[in-house]
């Protein structure tokens, strides 16, 4: 019996087609992805093959103005239209709190939404009961397939699930659910979830009875043969893990942003054992036409977005200096504003010992692309912010050693004075440079804001200590020459859309007046 698994993960609000780098589509003839194009390919496969499942491994939420405006209603509507068979909860599904998940998505989805390792307690338990499931048995042709879900247990540090959801260890939570399915004579089981490729492989190795793992969170690109675009494969597709009980378990993921449709064919014997597995992600490029009815629906929903981008978010009573002349040479108040917004967006009081889990922000000055003039009645709109942050990136959470941070700050000024983009703006950090010293030895003082303290204060950076830092995904990926961050980071979790972070902060503050306050000094 043959099953075709079509899968997406980490789509992050890319409902419309995008450029090759998953930013806003500029030249339509070269654009990729989007739900209209995805639907064309899915329908083509559904017509050609008998047993097809369309699965999503989480993080549909967050990433473009679509999510900012529609808050998840767009996810339910278009996933219903594409007739997804199941979805796992990702960490970003909790970005607007549990209510922001229940109302727009859980109550509206016509497909099961899954996670076995999230347990509700207190008053939420009855409210959310039955709205998401640990597993769902689905009819596929004349057979049945069990889908069991899982979600990153780091979600409380990455999003806003509140205090009434407990995120358990994935493997510990999955095993009894898989055992239950086996007891119920369900002998074909897919683990669908959002914990990253390393955990996907562990699940394949450790959870007895799981036949296939379909993952997300780490934006992992797997491919067999010559890759069709810019993404470099982390391994073959499918990635085969030998389980502790000796089975070959295929593990798949399909990069991110709806650029590819994962395509995996699995052959099972009559006892539900995997005999063979093969496939590859399908690049959703312009050779695949956009479905006209879905496209018309997208255009209809788009109207509200255009109206939103010119509405006032808040006011500034000072000039927001985002000029290259400032942000690439010294502390600029636009950099301070953005870093303050980044920290504010990551406030999670999950431990009495810590006032927050992260206090530091770094931001490449070259990523700040425009100032905002306060003389337009102080008005700040989404459109204004899109000029400041035009690249459609995210503000991510990483863990780095102090020594790596020191290298990053040396790199920040290694060729100072040439208006290059690597000059770092900061939050929760006090840095002093001496430019008379030779490159690589110019940081004379580097103090960081404590987190394990009731009264935050600045202490010298410790080289061997591990620190959490919020930074643009561009830096996490080694952009602007920050290779040491990419090479030495200990953990990397994708965060929220950059403009969304700043716009939410401005809306919350209502009136802003960021200052230049001595975060960056020269001796």
């Amino acid at each position: 019996w043959e099953l075709t698994i079509l899968h997406t993960n980490d789509v992050h609000s890319r409902l419309e087609q995008t450029s090759e780098d998953s930013s806003k589509c500029v030249n339509a003839s070269r654009c990729m992805g989007g739900v209209a194009r995805l639907f064309t390919k899915v329908q083509q496969i559904r017509r050609a093959e008998p047993n097809v499942l369309l699965l999503d491994a989480g993080d549909q939420y967050q990433g473009t103005i679509w999510f900012t405006v529609y808050k998840g209603a767009e996810v339910a509507h278009f996933m219903n239209a594409l007739r997804y068979d199941a979805m796992a909860l990702g960490n970003h599904e909790f970005d607007n709190g549990v209510e922001g998940l229940i109302e727009p998505l859980l109550k509206e989805a016509k497909f099961p939404i899954l996670s076995a390792n999230i347990k509700a307690k207190g008053p939420l338990a009855s409210q959310i009961s039955g709205l998401y499931l640990p597993y769902k048995v689905l009819p596929v042709g004349d057979e049945v397939v069990g889908i069991v879900g899982y979600t990153s247990k780091e979600t409380p540090f990455l999003s806003n699930p509140g205090t009434n959801l407990v995120f358990e260890d994935e493997i510990t939570a999955l095993q009894p659910e898989v055992d239950k399915l086996k007891t119920l004579n369900v002998n074909k089981i897919i683990a669908l979830g959002h914990s990253g490729f390393e955990m996907d492989k562990l699940i394949a190795q450790k959870v007895r009875g799981v036949d296939v793992v379909v993952g997300g969170h780490s934006n992992t690109f797997l491919y067999t043969g010559n890759p069709p675009s810019k993404e470099v494969p982390a391994g073959k597709y499918p990635f085969i893990v030998t389980s502790d009980d000796g089975r070959k378990v295929p593990v798949v993921q399909a990069y991110a942003f709806g650029k590819y449709l994962g395509y995996l064919k699995i052959e099972f014997d009559e006892r539900g054992n995997v005999i063979s597995s093969h496939g590859n992600p399908i690049l959703l490029n312009s050779s695949i036409p956009e479905d006209p009815s879905i496209k018309a629906d997208i255009n209809k929903w788009r109207i509200k977005l255009d109206n939103y981008s010119t509405q006032e978010l808040g006011k500034t009573i000072v000039y927001l200096d985002g000029s290259s002349q400032s942000c690439r040479f010294r502390e600029c108040n636009m950099g301070n504003l953005i870093c303050d917004a980044m920290i504010n967006n990551n406030l999670r009081h999950t431990d009495e010992m810590f006032w927050n889990h992260v206090s530091m922000c770094i931001l490449n000055g070259g990523g700040i692309r425009s100032p905002i003039d306060e003389r337009n009645n102080g008005t700040i709109t989404w459109e204004n912010l899109a000029a400041v942050l035009p690249f459609g990136g995210t503000f991510d959470l990483v863990q780095l050693k102090g020594s790596t941070l020191k290298k990053a700050f040396e790199h920040s000024v290694h060729r100072y004075g040439q208006s290059t983009g690597e000059f770092l703006q900061v939050g929760g950090i006090h840095v002093v440079y001496d430019l008379s010293r030779k490159p690589g030895d110019r940081v004379v003082k580097l103090d960081v804001l404590c987190t394990k303290c009731r009264v935050p204060s600045y202490d010298p950076l410790k080289m061997d200590e591990v620190y959490k830092v919020i930074l643009p995904n561009f830096l996490a990926n080694g952009g602007d020459g920050f290779q040491m961050i990419k090479d030495e980071l200990l953990r990397h979790d994708s965060g929220d859309q950059d403009i969304n972070v700043v716009s939410t902060y401005i809306s919350k503050m209502k009136v802003i007046y960021p200052a230049v306050e001595g975060r960056i000094k020269f001796s």
Epitope: Y135, P139, L184, N185
Partner: nanobody, 127 residues
């Protein structure tokens, strides 16, 4: 081989009663949410009544509330639908369905999600 077999259908006069049975073979109904659905000619299949395996909570469509009663006998691995005060509009093929997933009875009956196991159906005619 897993099977759901419905029985008890037939021809009955308006105001009459019937008791439908759904017997399972190949699996234990204790662990399943069970539903009765019906399909009249030219109409969509609709959920009539559902019962859970765990807490025996029940759900009834508005059109049958107060007239139909769902029950289960786990020892006999059978679920029943007692239908009283039957009306001509109750005429349909009645199907039994089962889902081992922990769905709510309401979600099962709507049905919100695809249901994996179905019987062949039994005809009920009220005239």
């Amino acid at each position: 081989q897993r099977q759901l077999v419905e029985s008890g259908g037939g021809l009955v006069q308006p105001g009459g009663s019937l008791r439908l049975s759904c017997a399972a073979s190949g699996f234990l109904l204790d662990y399943y949410v069970i539903g009765w659905f019906r399909q009249a000619p030219g109409k969509e299949r609709e959920g009539v009544s559902c019962i859970s395996g765990s807490d025996r909570s029940t759900y009834y469509a508005d059109s049958v509330k107060g007239r139909f009663t769902i029950s289960r006998d786990n020892a006999k691995n059978t679920v029943y639908l007692q239908m009283n005060s039957l009306k001509p509009e109750d005429t349909a093929v009645y199907f039994c369905a089962a889902d081992p997933s922990p769905v709510t009875v309401q979600a099962m009956c709507l049905p919100r999600f695809p249901v994996p196991y179905w019987g062949q159906g039994t005809q009920v005619t009220v005239s």
